[in-house]
Interface confidence: low
């Protein structure tokens, strides 16, 4: 808040000039302006200047009792109206009123535009108090004075519950043009004509304005701010700032880059981040993108085998982020791989080439001619079946996955074996009588495990009985047989 | 199994040398870059730099400009750091970390860390 | 240098919560950014990298997000054997700079 320092003076005298501590400063004395408070008018005379009369904002006081005489209207002083000065200097002005004694409680306080003034500014209040009236000076300063503090200054005071408002004191700070809007850096098509705006302003006005460019100046002739240059096209990067001039002197704006457009560099460091059997997981750093943003990226795939083609796989993804994971590749193959950007003038070129494999891919086809037959006197159930016929992206075979499912009333319990790769036959123990036993043998690779065979189910009766007839899936067919013994 | 296996604590005086090994194996140690970092006690880690495993090349922050050299030993697929003169300060753990790809420049295997106290 | 800003210092959760650790970067990263776990007496294990890839092995329930300045791991689900120090890693620019750390204490 303001602090109000209320200096008590020694008993001053009435006076009939100005009061104490009057402005002092390089300023211009105007015509008082229209009165701007909600007060009525009144006809009063002002107690230091007898016979003046002076139409200002003044509040009535109330008769006091029924016999006691109307006291004097109360107003502020006639004062300066306009003080014009430097950005930089430093301002003193004030406003004073005389107020009877029998007011004994009053506040003043420094409004400008309408909000009162509560931040770290120089506000003093002075009481030069008298037998009958107070003569009270409230001094606003401000210390080199910025644009910011240009408006209209008024004195509120309060009385009796009264509100006693000054006329406005304006404060116009001048100073070197003050830009309101500068050029901005852009990025321009080639030979295609664009806009450059520069705004400044005052006091003091007018401001006129100059481009420049590449350190050029281009209008012979000042425009009036604002000035919106028109540049019918560049092929080359430039430099555009522009001047600002008024009576006080001359401002030069930012410089900004213009840059025409371009393709983008080739992306750079490909990177393998993770390989399957059928995907790759790639990133990549984007190259400079040419002043323009990236739309889209390209991943172009070469299979890597003189038995291919050479046909170009793309595809295409977001410019970010800069990663891409490739799918539907085959396992167990060699890719090249080329990664390309665009903007909206072009295509890049394609980064380096980096070579990537495909993992092995799990077997595609099931074993064949599983065979099932129960081996009573051993409490064996024997599987037989023959090697299937795997591609070379599915990987060496490491071995085989039987799975034997037991149900009889109402259980149900599902074993996994594993074989090596060696054999085309194994046994199980039987795991429960009077059960259907259901056999599915899968092939397996590093990639992984290949399709379940159809089952073959065989049944393994109480002990006692005596059978050995197998069962059986021929190799080409779908049949669910069943051996019932 | 990618590993970094480091070698044990130290106890050295002020003035000494220290040189720990980080050795690696589950991969090619030359296709992978070897960053170091230090963590001084039950405090965060700062990354003292990291060496090219192809080249052999070293690259320093600035903090560790100076007393300390990374190297690294192809044939044993081992990178080490080597801190001389050394100081109260160099008390810490130091980790080494294996670059993860060469376009970026995270870490994606730490070794076990090999604490330093340096006491007189 | 680029600073790397992470919050909380600690933080404590129950088993099947969700919690996020965040981490702001001084300047723009993109989004290079790692996350790593790292339990008393273990090395660090990495749980993800360029903001949002998850490391081989590491469970779906550790999410990465964010780019530019902002970025944020997620564990859903929490789990006993989530207890321990996470912490973030910048790798755009040298020197590479590393988050505070978080301590993350099950209830």
């Known amino acids: 808040a303001i602090t109000e320092a209320r200096e008590e003076a020694k008993p001053y005298p009435l006076f009939p000039g100005p009061l104490p501590g009057s402005l002092q400063t390089d300023h211009t004395s105007l015509l008082s302006l229209p009165h701007t408070s909600g007060y009525q008018p009144a006809l009063m005379f002002s107690p230091t200047q007898p016979g003046r009369p002076y139409t200002g904002n003044v509040a009535i006081p109330r008769v006091t009792s029924a016999g006691s005489k109307l006291l004097p209207p109360l107003a502020f002083k006639h004062t300066v109206g306009h003080i014009i000065l430097s950005e930089h200097k430093d301002v003193k002005f004030n406003c004073s009123i005389s107020v009877p004694n029998i007011y004994q409680d009053t506040t003043i306080s420094w409004w400008k535009d309408g909000k009162e003034l509560l931040g770290a500014h120089h506000a003093i209040t002075q009481f030069y108090p008298d037998d009958e009236v107070t003569a009270i000076i409230a001094s606003f300063s401000i210390t080199s004075v910025q644009r910011s503090d240009n408006g209209s200054y008024i004195c509120k005071m309060k009385i009796n519950n009264e509100e006693i408002v000054s006329d406005p004191i304006y404060i116009e700070v001048q100073g070197l043009p003050h830009f309101t809007k500068q050029p901005e850096s852009m990025n321009v098509t080639r030979n295609t004509a664009f806009n450059l705006t520069c705004q400044a302003v005052g006091p003091p006005e007018p401001v006129n304005i100059f481009w420049v460019q590449n350190s050029s100046r281009v209008n012979e002739q000042p425009e009036k701010s604002p000035s919106v240059l028109t540049v019918p096209g560049l092929t080359e990067m430039a430099v555009f700032s522009c001047e600002a001039h008024n009576d006080k002197g001359l401002t030069v704006s930012k410089g900004v880059q213009i840059n025409i457009k371009a393709i983008p560099s080739p992306p750079t460091e490909v990177s393998i981040h993770n390989s399957t059997a059928h995907s790759i997981l790639i990133s990549w750093v984007p190259g400079f993108d040419g002043y323009s943003p990236f739309r889209n990226c390209s991943v172009q795939v070469k299979e890597v085998d003189p038995l291919s083609n050479g046909s170009v796989m793309i595809f295409n993804t977001s410019a970010s982020p800069h990663m891409y994971q490739i799918k539907q590749l085959q396992a167990l193959a060699n890719y090249s791989i080329g990664v390309s950007c665009m903007n909206e003038i072009g295509w890049s070129a394609v980064s380096p080439w980096i070579l990537a494999s495909t993992t092995e891919g799990a077997p595609s086809v099931a074993p064949l001619n599983v065979t099932v037959f129960l081996n009573e006197s051993r409490d064996n159930v024997d599987i037989r079946w023959m090697k299937p016929l795997t591609k070379r992206q599915a990987g060496e075979l490491v071995g085989y996955r039987i799975s034997h499912v037991w149900q009889s009333a109402g259980i149900s319990k599902e074993l996994l074996e594993e074989v090596g790769q060696n054999n085309s036959r194994a046994q199980i123990s039987v795991q429960v009588h009077n059960a259907t036993c259901t056999v599915r043998i899968a092939a397996v690779t590093k990639g992984g495990v290949g399709p379940f065979s159809d089952p073959v189910k065989i049944f393994i009766p109480a002990h006692g009985w005596v059978d050995h007839a197998p069962s059986s899936t021929p190799a080409p067919g779908n049949a669910d047989p069943v051996l019932i013994i | 199994l990618i590993q970094l296996v480091q070698s044990g604590p130290e106890l050295k005086k002020p003035g000494e040398t220290v040189k720990i090994s980080c050795k690696a194996s589950?991969?090619?140690?030359?296709?992978?870059?070897m960053n170091w970092v230090k963590q001084d006690p039950g405090k965060g880690l700062k990354w003292m730099g990291w060496i090219n495993t192809y080249t052999g090349e070293p690259t320093y922050a600035d903090d560790f400009k100076g007393r300390f050299v990374f190297s690294m030993e192809t044939s044993a697929s081992a990178a080490f750091l080597q801190i001389n003169n050394l100081k109260n300060e160099d008390t810490a753990t130091y980790f080494c970390?294996?670059?993860?790809?060469?376009?970026?420049?995270?870490?994606?295997?730490w070794g076990q860390g090999t604490t330093l106290t340096v006491s007189s | 240098d680029i600073v790397m800003t992470q919050s909380p210092k600690f933080m404590s959760t129950s088993v099947g919560d969700r919690v996020s650790i965040t981490c702001k970067a001084s300047?723009?990263?993109?989004?290079?950014v790692a996350w790593y776990k790292k339990k008393p007496g273990q090395s660090p294990k990495a749980l993800i990298n360029l903001a949002s890839n998850r490391h081989t092995g590491v469970p779906d329930r550790f999410t990465g997000s964010g780019s530019g300045t902002d970025f944020t791991l997620t564990i859903s689900n929490v789990q006993s054997e989530d207890l321990a120090d996470y912490f973030c890693l910048q790798h755009w620019n040298y020197p590479l700079t590393f988050g505070g750390g978080t301590k993350l204490e099950i209830k």
């Open positions: 970390a294996r670059k993860g790809v060469t376009a970026a420049r995270y870490f994606d295997y």
């Open positions: 300047q723009n990263v993109r989004t290079a």
């Open positions: 589950g991969y090619t140690f030359t296709n992978h870059g």
